[in-house]
């Protein structure tokens, strides 16, 4: 039961995380205009990975896509790449993990196959989460660097009468969404890897060994049956060990509505 719960929870957490990574990647608010210690402007600037937007006091919002590829900063390209890799890996991970779920039966899939698939999806989720966290962190670092550079520029080179206000950008909502989503995907991946350990069959081979005792004849036969001693009323063979790593939660049961995520 614990393995199914761990696997299911890992899947759900990863699903939420990947949805968050996709949302963060698509969001326009990766960086937002810093309003602190800034002259009160009637326009609010914010930027995403794919376009920059301006919201006027009038309510009119204008967004312009970054139509150039070569003209964009290398760091922005790197962040885009990390986020896309994270999404792709996460999506593949989700696909794999669906088939790996214990509550979903596909033909006569071996437990070892499910364990391998669970491990694969877990690793994919971990890498996906790390990609997202790395991408968001690179962007955040870029913002911090630019923020202090623009702050320095604000207080220098103002010898002339006319002042130009430097627009400074700070962390946008997408960064926090990305960090949380990346973390969730990572946690989900770790949970899948933990679940995999519980799913993996323990390869234990019990060879047939015949012991000839001087008094009573006690034979241990392969196939999981304990032979009776030949004495007394206990003449039925009782199945006490099956040789496989089958746990109690693997007992056949009809799937409930909670089994499907």
């Amino acid at each position: 039961m614990a393995v199914t719960a761990c696997q299911g929870l890992g899947f759900v957490v990863s699903l939420i995380g990947i949805a968050g990574i996709i949302a963060a990647t698509c969001m326009d608010q990766w960086s937002t205009q810093d309003l602190y210690n800034n002259p009160v402007t009637a326009v609010f600037n914010y930027q995403g990975l794919w376009r920059s937007c301006v919201r006027e006091s009038s309510g009119f919002t204008e967004c312009r896509g970054y139509f150039t590829l070569l003209g964009l900063p290398a760091m922005l390209q790197a962040v885009r790449a990390l986020m896309i890799v994270g999404i792709v890996l996460g999506a593949i991970g989700l696909l794999v993990s669906i088939f790996a779920l214990k509550c979903i039966r596909i033909g006569s899939m071996e437990d070892s196959a499910k364990a391998n698939m669970t491990l694969t999806s877990g690793i994919m989720f971990i890498v996906s989460g790390l990609c997202a966290i790395a991408g968001v962190s690179v962007f955040a670092n870029m913002l911090v660097t630019n923020f202090w550079m623009s702050t320095a520029n604000m207080y220098t080179g103002m010898g002339g009468m006319v002042q130009t206000v430097q627009t400074r950008y700070t962390f946008g909502a997408a960064l926090f969404v990305g960090w949380v989503a990346g973390g969730l995907t990572l946690i989900g991946g770790v949970m899948m890897c933990i679940a995999c350990r519980g799913l993996a069959p323990e390869e234990t081979n019990y060879k047939a060994v015949s012991y000839h005792a001087s008094g009573h004849s006690v034979a241990y036969k392969p196939g999981g049956f304990k032979a009776s001693t030949g004495f007394g009323s206990n003449t039925k063979n009782k199945k006490i060990y099956d040789g496989g790593a089958r746990t109690e939660d693997e007992v056949q049961s009809y799937p409930s509505k909670h089994d499907y995520v």
Epitope: V40, T41, A42, V43, Y46, V54, S58, G59, V162
Partner: antibody
């Protein structure tokens, strides 16, 4: 078409209060902020501030903080300018105007003349 | 507050003539986010409310004759009337729409001979 109709001229004594209305039609009232502009006789235009008709939040120019209050009533599609404790220098024509592209004042009311005389 | 300086204060021209008036702001009105200048031009005829002519420094409001043209960027802006008509007799105001408060210029009074 968009129209802003302001209340009629007002004759007030110093120290009194005046409330000017600006009724909007031809658009969704809460979609555009309402600005107020003062024009003293023979003088230029002076931006007083604006009210976000969706949130009710107001922004005032420094010269118009204190005695001046903007308000709006969505159901009546009307914005209001209230001036308390009227002074002689408040004698002017007051215009309401909606915010448009580029934060411009796109549509204007006909103006309300407020006369302050003892 | 942003100071908007308009010059000249008065302009007397003949019908059909080209006229240019200027507006200078104490700070740049260019927004780096969309590369637009938040400067607006209005026309106020005697006894009437102002009328929007140009926003974003150079975008003509619908219904405004194409003889009116706005130009400039940053701190220096110009309104040009390519061929003045008798009905253009008015005061022209520029306005900063980037920083609060939205200050107006003192106006340029255009008289047609």
């Amino acid at each position: 078409q968009i129209q802003l109709v302001q209340s009629g001229p007002e004759l007030k004594k110093p120290g009194e209060t005046v409330k000017i209305s600006c009724k909007a039609s031809g658009y969704t009232f809460t979609n555009y902020g309402m600005n107020w502009v003062k024009q003293a006789p023979g003088k230029g235009l002076k931006w007083m501030g604006w009210i976000n008709t969706y949130t009710g939040e107001s922004t005032y120019a420094d010269d118009f903080k204190g005695r001046f209050a903007f308000s709006s009533e969505t159901s009546a599609r009307t914005a209001y300018l209230q001036i308390n404790n009227l002074k002689n220098e408040d004698m002017a024509t007051y215009f309401c105007a909606t915010l448009g592209y580029g934060n411009s004042l796109a549509y204007w009311g006909q103006g309300t003349l407020v006369t302050v005389s003892s | 507050d942003i100071v908007m300086t308009q010059y000249p204060s008065f302009l007397t021209v003949t019908t059909g003539e080209k006229v240019t008036m200027s507006c200078k702001s104490s700070q740049s009105l260019l927004n780096s986010g969309n590369q637009r200048n938040y400067l607006t031009w209005y026309q106020q005829k005697p006894g009437q409310p102002p009328k929007l002519l140009i926003y974003w420094a150079s975008t003509r409001e619908s219904g405004v004759p194409d003889r009116f043209a706005g130009s400039g960027s940053g701190t220096d802006f110009t309104l040009t009337i390519s061929s003045v008509q008798a009905e253009d007799l008015a005061i022209y105001y520029c306005q900063n729409n980037y920083f609060y408060p939205f200050t107006f210029g003192s106006g340029t009074k255009l008289e047609v001979k």
